[in-house]
């Protein structure tokens, strides 16, 4: 009586249950009444990450340096290569197929969150009392100088792009 369904890690073919090939191996030939499924290890730079009946292994992902990519984790016969971006760049998608330069925060904006290999810089406008006078991917908004603590007075008010200008207090004539 031939089976109609097979167990986990098996597949039905020619009215019998054959074992799937384990991760890292591809199918060469199906099982017979007397022999088990024939499997072969994936070659160099190839992988299969599941129990399978694939006749070809998948190629490892290529981390193209021309796209700003580098290898974060080398692939094995059971896992794909994981790419990430060169310093100063981040992935354009979750699959990390290409990279773009980290965004800089314009004057008047500071870095809220520094970019990573997978996320861009997050900028925020400098609130009252803070400024940024540079375009940067790292600089936060800086607080205005406190003239009072230097025994000086404000001669020119600060903006979100400029610091206050302090000067000496007027002498009484």
């Amino acid at each position: 009586e031939p089976p109609t369904a097979c167990r986990e890690k098996q597949y039905l073919i020619n009215s019998q249950c054959c074992s799937l090939c384990q991760p890292g191996q591809k199918l060469v030939s199906d099982c017979t009444e007397f022999t088990e499924t024939e499997c072969l290890p994936c070659g160099e730079s190839e992988f299969l990450d599941t129990w399978n009946r694939e006749t070809h292994c998948h190629q490892h992902k290529y981390c193209d340096p021309n796209l700003g990519l580098r290898v974060q984790q080398k692939g094995t016969s059971e896992t794909d290569t994981i790419c990430t971006c060169e310093e100063g760049w981040h992935c354009t998608s979750e699959a990390c197929e290409s990279c773009v330069l980290h965004r800089s925060c314009s004057p008047g904006f500071g870095v809220k969150q520094i970019a990573t290999g997978v996320s861009d810089t997050i900028c925020e406008p400098c609130p009252v009392g803070f400024f940024s006078n540079v375009s940067s991917a790292f600089e936060k908004c800086h607080p205005w100088t406190s003239c009072e603590t230097k025994d000086l007075v404000v001669q020119q008010a600060g903006t979100n792009k400029t610091d206050v200008v302090c000067g000496p207090q007027d002498r009484l004539r």
């Epitope: 089976p3 890690k9 098996q10 249950c17 384990q22 022999t35 088990e36 072969l40």
Partner: antibody, heavy 120, light 107 residues
């Protein structure tokens, strides 16, 4: 949890028939998909696969064994049995019943073993 | 029939040691090899199947590797309960066969 328990006489006379039964609990033989197997361990020697049966009664036997083999299944009692006829002293061994998830193994559950001595 | 040759036939080691047992098949068996542990008077216990897959509930100090004709079982750090006899079994073709066993003893 799956349990297998072997039962049968511990002493058999040469040229007679060795009969053992394996009672399965925690799994139904009739649910299919497993192969119910007999394996023996000779004193001071290695393990030897005797044969198996599926829930539907399909069998495979080891042709290297000299004594004729019969493995049968009784799904109503959730048991399977081994018969070795015309036994000799070479059939003295610790007999195990086991479960396999494919025709080729591996054997994930085993009985505790039943020692059978063939006397002349 | 496929013959499986295990080596060494016996090995002495201490708790904490790393131990490797090899199993060589007389012909290619892909990755269809299992490893079992057996203690005196007890049933064998499945450790590894499909050459390198760890059976559920088996400690991760046990690992298997190999394909074709050469296979290894490695115990990374021996524990007192690991002293036993180890058998390989080819799951490639009938009749199913076992290796002769490797007895792991306390040094």
């Amino acid at each position: 949890e799956v349990h297998l328990v072997e039962s049968g006489p511990g002493l058999v006379k040469a040229s007679q028939t060795l009969s053992l039964t394996c009672t399965v609990s925690g799994d139904s033989i009739s649910s299919g998909g497993y192969y119910w197997t007999w394996i023996r361990h000779h004193p001071g020697r290695g393990l030897e696969w005797i044969g198996h049966i599926s829930y539907s009664g399909r069998t495979s036997y080891n042709p290297s064994l000299k004594s004729p083999i019969t493995i049968s299944v009784d799904t109503s009692k959730n048991q399977f049995s081994l018969r070795l006829s015309s036994v000799t002293a070479a059939d003295t061994a610790l007999y195990f019943c086991a479960r396999a998830s494919t025709r080729f193994g591996p054997f994930d559950y085993w009985g505790q073993g039943s020692l059978v001595t063939v006397s002349s | 029939d496929i013959r499986l040759t295990q080596s060494p036939s016996s090995v002495s080691a201490s708790v904490g040691d790393r131990v490797t047992i090899t199993c060589r098949a007389s012909q290619g068996i892909s990755s269809w090899l299992a490893w079992y542990q057996q203690k005196p008077g007890k049933a064998p216990k499945l450790l590894i199947y499909a050459a390198s897959s760890l059976q559920s509930g088996v400690p991760s100090r046990f690992s298997g590797s190999g394909s074709g004709t050469d296979f290894t079982l490695t115990i990374s750090s021996l524990q007192p309960e690991d002293f036993a006899t180890y058998y390989c079994q080819q799951a490639n073709s009938f009749p199913l066969t076992f290796g002769g066993g490797t007895k792991l003893e306390i040094k």
